[in-house]
């Protein structure tokens, strides 16, 4: 499709101050026929570490346009944005309010995309072209991954460790795709 | 690019199950939607199930449920595909097939080479 | 479960155009059922021309298009060439359960 690149997995946000949005609510759908018994994805936990919550990273909200070619989705689709680093969960608001942020000793933490949800949107084209129906992929949720070799994507590591499971209970999508991102209009962007 | 490699022919008695395996390569298997589709021999196409990205859950056709399960083993990137209480007519070839991980959700854009599995006494 | 409904089969002078239609027993093929559209070829796996009603992919020949037409979904092949001689199928989308067609026979004489 020829989509400019929208953001990059290394690109790191700033986040605004304030507090942290809650994640965009699923998806409503009466789609219950044919689903595996207890389907649906768990919340995912990264952080096998004592304290789930030592790890943290930033979710925010922004709204836009998508495009297909010249045409635009009727109504915005509303994603997250996973700010760039990551750090303990306790520090993350102070430490942003002083302008200060906590960087690991070790390994480097980024707080990427880890789950991916699916939204229909119906397109708008100029010129009286038939509308279009799509199915575009937005970022969910965001986790913190360790970086393993410095500024290398392809070498985000989970804090913990992944074995068979059934899909109904499968780990989400791990990272964005950035090659592929759209010409996308920022609209009241957070 | 997603490639997918699947597991090699099986013959089956009746009653038995069969478990068909799809290798992801070119992107990790968390990355991408999984979907299984057979062919028996001489006829058409048919969806079995896989996984729906708009509400995080895997869903199966009418016709198998119950008996199909669909799984993956992410340290391998390997999604199976079992089928239990086979019969005669479960004789076909199974195929994987996967999203291109774009930005736009497209199904089926890549294929396994496909799996025969005969269900003979 | 729908049924979906194409033509068992359709031949096509070479250098000519051909319809095919994907029809669905719910009612109006639209834009929200995401129609695909597959070429296979015997003895090889199925490989995808169109997708969401019209949008094709990198592999697609121009010569094949797709569009939504009297309440079905069809591909149109334009200057058939001997090599698109293969069974083409349709797929429909009813809300994450997906329905194949039958399949449509193509014959390029």
């Known amino acids: 499709q020829g989509w400019q690149a929208f953001k990059n997995d290394a690109t790191e946000i700033i986040p605004e101050l304030g507090e942290y949005p809650e994640p965009p609510p699923e998806l409503e759908n009466n789609k219950t026929m044919n689903r595996a018994e207890n389907g649906g994805r768990p919340p995912h936990h990264p952080f096998e570490t004592k304290d789930v919550s030592e790890y943290s990273c930033r979710e925010l909200h922004f709204t836009r346009y998508v495009t297909d070619g010249p045409c635009r989705s009727a109504k915005p689709v509303t994603e997250l944005v996973c700010s760039g680093q990551c750090g303990p969960a306790r520090l993350l608001p102070n430490a942003i309010g002083r302008g200060k942020w906590w960087r690991p000793s070790g390994p480097d933490f980024r707080c990427i995309p880890d789950r991916y949800r699916a939204q229909r949107v119906q397109l708008l084209c100029p010129g009286g072209e038939a509308p279009r129906a799509r199915k575009v992929r937005l970022v969910a949720s965001c986790k913190c991954k360790r970086l393993t070799r410095f500024h290398n994507q392809s070498e985000l590591k989970d804090f913990g460790t992944e074995a068979a499971r059934p899909q109904k209970g499968r780990k989400p999508r791990p990272r964005a795709r950035s090659a592929k991102a759209n010409q996308a209009e920022l609209e009241n962007a957070y | 690019e997603v490639q997918l490699v699947q597991s090699g022919a099986e013959v089956k008695k009746p009653g038995a199950s069969v478990k068909v395996s799809c290798k992801v390569s070119g992107y990790t298997l968390s990355e991408l939607s999984i979907h299984w589709v057979r062919q028996a021999p001489g006829k058409g196409l048919e969806w079995m199930g896989g996984f729906d990205p708009e509400d995080g859950e895997t869903i199966y056709a009418q016709k198998f449920q119950g008996r199909v399960t669909m799984t993956e083993d992410t340290s391998t990137d390997t999604a199976y595909m079992e089928l239990s209480s086979l019969r005669s007519e479960d004789t076909a070839v199974y195929y994987c097939?996967?999203?291109?991980?774009?930005?736009?959700?497209?199904?089926?854009?890549?294929w396994g080479q496909g799996t025969l599995v005969t269900v003979s006494s | 479960q729908a049924v979906v409904t194409q033509e068992p089969s359709l031949t096509v002078s070479p250098g000519g155009t051909v319809t095919l239609t994907c029809g669905s027993s719910?009612?109006?093929?639209?834009?929200?059922?995401?129609p695909y559209w597959f070429q296979q070829k015997p003895g090889q796996a199925p490989r995808t021309l169109i997708s969401?009603?019209?949008d094709k992919h990198s592999w697609t020949p121009a010569r094949f298009s797709g569009s939504l037409l009297g309440g079905k979904a069809a591909l149109t092949l334009s200057g058939a060439q001997p090599e698109d001689e293969a069974e083409y199928y349709c797929?429909?989308?009813?809300?994450?359960?997906?329905?194949f067609g039958g399949g449509t026979k193509l014959t390029v004489l």
């Open positions: 969401d009603t019209d």
């Open positions: 797929l429909l989308d009813y809300g994450g359960s997906f329905v």
């Open positions: 097939a996967t999203d291109s991980a774009g930005y736009w959700y497209k199904f089926f854009q890549h």
């Open positions: 719910t009612g109006a093929v639209t834009i929200d059922h995401y």
